[in-house]
Interface confidence: low
């Protein structure tokens, strides 16, 4: 057969979906590959045709549409499983053609177990919520164009593995779950399950979403840099190890960027010739504020080293701050017998 | 070789606690074990106690009876799962075993320690 | 609370007969087929023999079998052997939500007739 764009294996696109359940998967020809959509190539004369690879085999072959209930079909771009079985493990290719065109991509699709209490191999995602921040919810994530807007589903809503009834302070709210206040405790695996009729049939979505409490932007403040600070001096000989360690405190802030750097004598270490090494560290708080702690180190210091400005930096999106170290040489202790010469006027 | 092991049996008196310790050895926990205790008093049938999804803290189980008075944990990073047995009666003689299931979806406990006996007796 | 009743307590058998053993749980077990078989020696940890119902464990004989789905299994020895007198439990996985996660069998003690 002619030439075919071939877009690979998207495994950027690791689909996820769980066992007995519904499953609607797009072709990720039409989202992240061509710059025209599935109406277009269809109004073209294109055809979308659609194969698999079993798990551990090398041979590609048709999907089939023929099976009792209609249980794999497609419809337009989509690909539908009514439900998935384990063994619909594997790599499922969308090729989009006709005689003079042909463009195709191919991506895994891995059908995942879970027990009765909702653990699975399946990767969560996480939602943030701020901390006693007022009114926050969370939304049973991807259950778009698995039923008409015309059909009432029943949503249940878990924490782990109980079901949602009677909480302090959160809320079932059809396909929202209300957090009044947010706590620590509140931490945790979150689960709607969706039941929907369909042509006499019963069917459920289960969707998992870990929620994690953060700290909240009204308490957020810029980074305070802990050390270096002006009660400690860094006082030493030439030749000894120079250890000045900078820690930062940053207070959560959504997708805010945390740097904290070293300068000596206005440069970043790299533009200098000093034989000077940086590492860093990080913790976070519970709350996911995160202390950064990044400690300057000369093996063996010399008396210019002494003379140098050492200044450690931070930014966040909150702002930026710099503190430079107290750095000094130390005086040599007297050498008694030579004073002691001296003070009896010997010459 | 691939084990679990388990350590902490003894001779208690009613009222008192203990805590029984199941060390693994040849394996990691992963995250999709299901880590479980399960208990046989003598000359009866097996017992489940509890069980701790590896991959969520939020996940531990209880059988009815157990909540409140027994609870189960694990480190991770000693590979050692935990029960911690309080206001202990007669009834809870029995030969503690702590099992693994992997995959935690009705594969069954396809691993087993051999077992550490806790008597409650005055 | 949940229930698995098996039957019956004890059997004796000989050498090379087919033995059959139910379990019976008071409610559907998860995903109808949550359900395993383990066979326990004296002095000695439970072994798993079969699990979902009907899948064979690593390493063990074919003789052994399991069937059944919902609330009734059977575990199935096609030809006893002398390593098979034991005692056997089924186990079965509950929804937690609603009830105790596992519960097991009280246990079917084979002896040599």
């Known amino acids: 057969s002619e030439r075919c764009d071939d877009w690979g294996l998207d495994t950027m696109r690791q689909i996820q979906v769980f066992e007995d359940e519904p499953a609607r998967i797009k072709c990720p020809l039409f989202e992240h590959f061509l710059k025209f959509n599935y109406s277009t190539a269809h109004s073209a004369g294109l055809t979308l045709i659609w194969y698999w690879t079993r798990q551990d085999r090398d041979l590609e072959e048709p999907i089939n549409f023929r099976l009792p209930e209609n249980r794999i079909s497609k419809e337009k771009d989509v690909l539908w499983f009514r439900p998935t079985l384990l063994n619909d493990t594997g790599n499922y290719t969308c090729m989009l053609r006709n005689t003079t065109y042909c463009s195709k991509v191919a991506f895994p699709l891995e059908v995942v177990q879970k027990d009765s209490c909702f653990n699975s191999p399946m990767k969560l995602p996480v939602h943030k919520l701020y901390i006693e921040y007022g009114i926050q919810r969370i939304t049973c994530p991807n259950v778009d164009g698995y039923f008409p807007s015309s059909v009432k589903p029943t949503i249940t809503w878990y924490m782990g593995c109980y079901k949602i009834q009677n909480f302090n302070n959160v809320i079932p709210e059809g396909m929202n779950l209300s957090f009044l206040i947010a706590l620590i405790s509140n931490n945790g695996n979150y689960t709607c399950v969706v039941t929907y009729p369909e042509n006499g049939r019963t069917f459920h979505l289960t969707r998992t979403l870990t929620v994690k409490v953060v700290g909240s932007p009204k308490n957020a403040v810029p980074p305070v840099i802990h050390s270096p600070n002006d009660h400690v001096v860094y006082e030493k000989e030439p030749g000894e190890e120079l250890l000045i360690p900078c820690t930062v405190y940053f207070s959560f802030l959504m997708d805010s960027r945390n740097e904290v750097w070293w300068t000596i004598d206005g440069k970043k270490p790299d533009d200098i010739t000093i034989d000077v090494t940086i590492n860093e560290s990080i913790s976070h708080s519970r709350t996911e504020d995160e202390t950064r702690t990044q400690i300057l180190s000369i093996k063996k210091v010399t008396s210019e080293d002494l003379k140098r400005s050492y200044v450690c930096h931070a930014r966040s999106a909150k702002g930026e701050v710099a503190k430079a170290a107290k750095v000094k040489q130390k005086v040599p202790a007297p050498r008694y017998t030579v004073e002691l010469a001296c003070g009896f006027g010997a010459t | 070789e691939v084990q679990l092991e388990e350590s902490g049996g003894d001779l208690v008196q009613p009222g008192g606690s203990l805590r029984l310790s199941c060390a693994a050895s040849?394996?990691?926990?992963?995250?999709?074990?299901?880590m479980c205790w399960v208990r046989q008093a003598p000359g009866k049938g097996l017992e489940w106690v509890s069980c701790?999804?590896?991959?969520?803290?939020?996940?531990?189980y209880y059988a009815t009876w157990a909540k409140g008075r027994f609870t189960i944990s694990r480190d991770n990073s000693k590979n050692t799962l935990y029960l911690q047995m309080n206001s202990l009666r007669a009834e809870d003689t029995a030969v503690y075993f702590c099992?693994?299931?992997?995959?935690?979806?009705?594969?069954?406990?396809?691993?087993w320690g051999q077992g550490t006996l806790v008597t409650v007796s005055s | 609370d949940i229930v698995m009743t098996q039957s019956p307590s004890s059997l004796s058998a000989s050498v090379g007969d087919r033995v059959t053993i139910t379990c019976q749980a008071s409610?559907?077990?998860?995903?109808?087929?949550?359900l395993s078989w383990y066979q326990q020696k004296p002095g000695q940890a439970p072994k798993l023999l079969i699990y979902?119902?009907?899948t064979l464990a690593s390493g063990v004989p074919s003789r052994f079998s399991g069937s059944g789905s919902g609330t009734d299994f059977t575990l199935t020895i096609s030809s006893l052997q002398p390593e098979d007198f034991a005692t056997y439990y089924c186990?079965?996985?509950?929804?937690?939500?609603?009830?105790?996660?596992?519960?097991f069998g009280g246990g079917t003690k084979v002896v040599i007739k």
């Open positions: 099992a693994r299931s992997t995959g935690s979806v009705g594969r069954g406990f396809n691993l």
């Open positions: 409610q559907s077990v998860y995903n109808s087929n949550h």
């Open positions: 040849g394996i990691s926990f992963s995250s999709s074990d299901f």
């Open positions: 701790i999804y590896a991959g969520s803290s939020v996940s531990i």
């Open positions: 979902s119902a009907s």
């Open positions: 186990q079965g996985e509950f929804s937690c939500v609603s009830a105790d996660c596992i519960a």
